[in-house]
């Protein structure tokens, strides 16, 4: 009856049709499962835990970028429940490679100990 319902659809026994799973709002993530024709009885949305964010819809909350610990960069904008953190310039003692393609996380800062001579962030 419902084998053709989509990834984010459940089968509504009242209408005989697939129906969109209720999407979550920004700062929320789905609790339990809904999709491909089925929906858990207690399916709903719950707020993102601390240090995580979500744009809403059906995505789970993701951890904020760790600007200082992972990227060795300053925090330009701290993340909240609805938005990821934004990283700023490198921390003191670190530099960013010029013309280096961004990886999936953005730009990564490297230790001045490994820098070529006269790298501007590392001079002085």
């Amino acid at each position: 009856e419902y084998s053709n319902c989509g990834e984010n659809e459940y089968y509504n026994q009242t209408t005989g049709l697939c129906q969109e799973c209720p999407p979550c709002g920004p700062g929320e993530e789905p609790y339990l499962s809904c999709g491909y024709g089925t929906k858990d009885e207690d399916y709903g949305c719950v707020p993102c835990p601390a240090e995580k964010f979500s744009k809403g819809g059906y995505q789970i909350c993701r951890r904020h970028k760790d600007c200082e610990g992972f990227f060795r960069a300053t925090v330009l904008t701290p993340g909240d429940m609805e938005n990821d953190a934004e990283c700023g310039p490198c921390l003191p003692g670190y530099y960013m490679l010029e013309n280096r393609p961004r990886n999936i996380y953005g730009m990564v800062c490297y230790s001045c100990l490994l820098a070529p001579p006269n790298t501007k962030e590392c001079v002085g």
Partner: antibody
Amino acid sequence: EVQLQQSGPELVKPGASVKMSCKASGYSFTGYNMHWVKQSHGKSLEWIGYIDPYNGATSKNQKFKGKATLTVDKSSTTAYIQLNSLTSEDSAVYYCARYYYGDYHWYFDVWGAGTTVTVSS
Amino acid sequence: DVVMTQTPLSLPVSLGDQASISCRSSQSLVHSNGNTYLHWYLQQPGQSPKLLIYKVSNRFSGVPDRFSGSGSGTDFTLKISRVEAEDLGVYFCSQHTHVPPTFGAGTKLELK
């Protein structure tokens, strides 16, 4: 009297898009799902999908997921279907149909007159 | 998707004749709720389809009693006891037990 009034015929070029309307009257617009059905050149009928005018939620036949966009304007009690990247395969009559689901019945009880779409260069 | 097969595709009749149209589905149309969602629609020339019979055998409001539906599981029949001129057109069976809803290819009822 319950009526579904559809927009007039469309002649469109391949690759273009088209948006058709279905104006509902004589009943509570948000109380019934609105479905869209395709009929190619007097042949059989194909279910495209539906929209719930109450909340705008939609569900579509897998075959039309990249082709059709369904929307509503509650203030004017009008449903819309937009078809994109048109090819000759999209030349057809498109019907809107009201869906009844009281008492576990589930059928199309009122149909619009249809909009003829011709895709030609 | 559930395939609906109608026979015949064309049915020549004389006014006053009995007519019978068959519809077979590729899967059982008995829903888990116990209902069988097999409907019949008539499309008269130049018009949109109109509901005639819902859930196998229930006549929709305003449909004359010369129309009757029967069947179960995967095999269904629409009968017209005495064909009148206004009955001419294309008859479609349709299932709404499974998603997506599907229709038969249609049977054209026409004068001999």
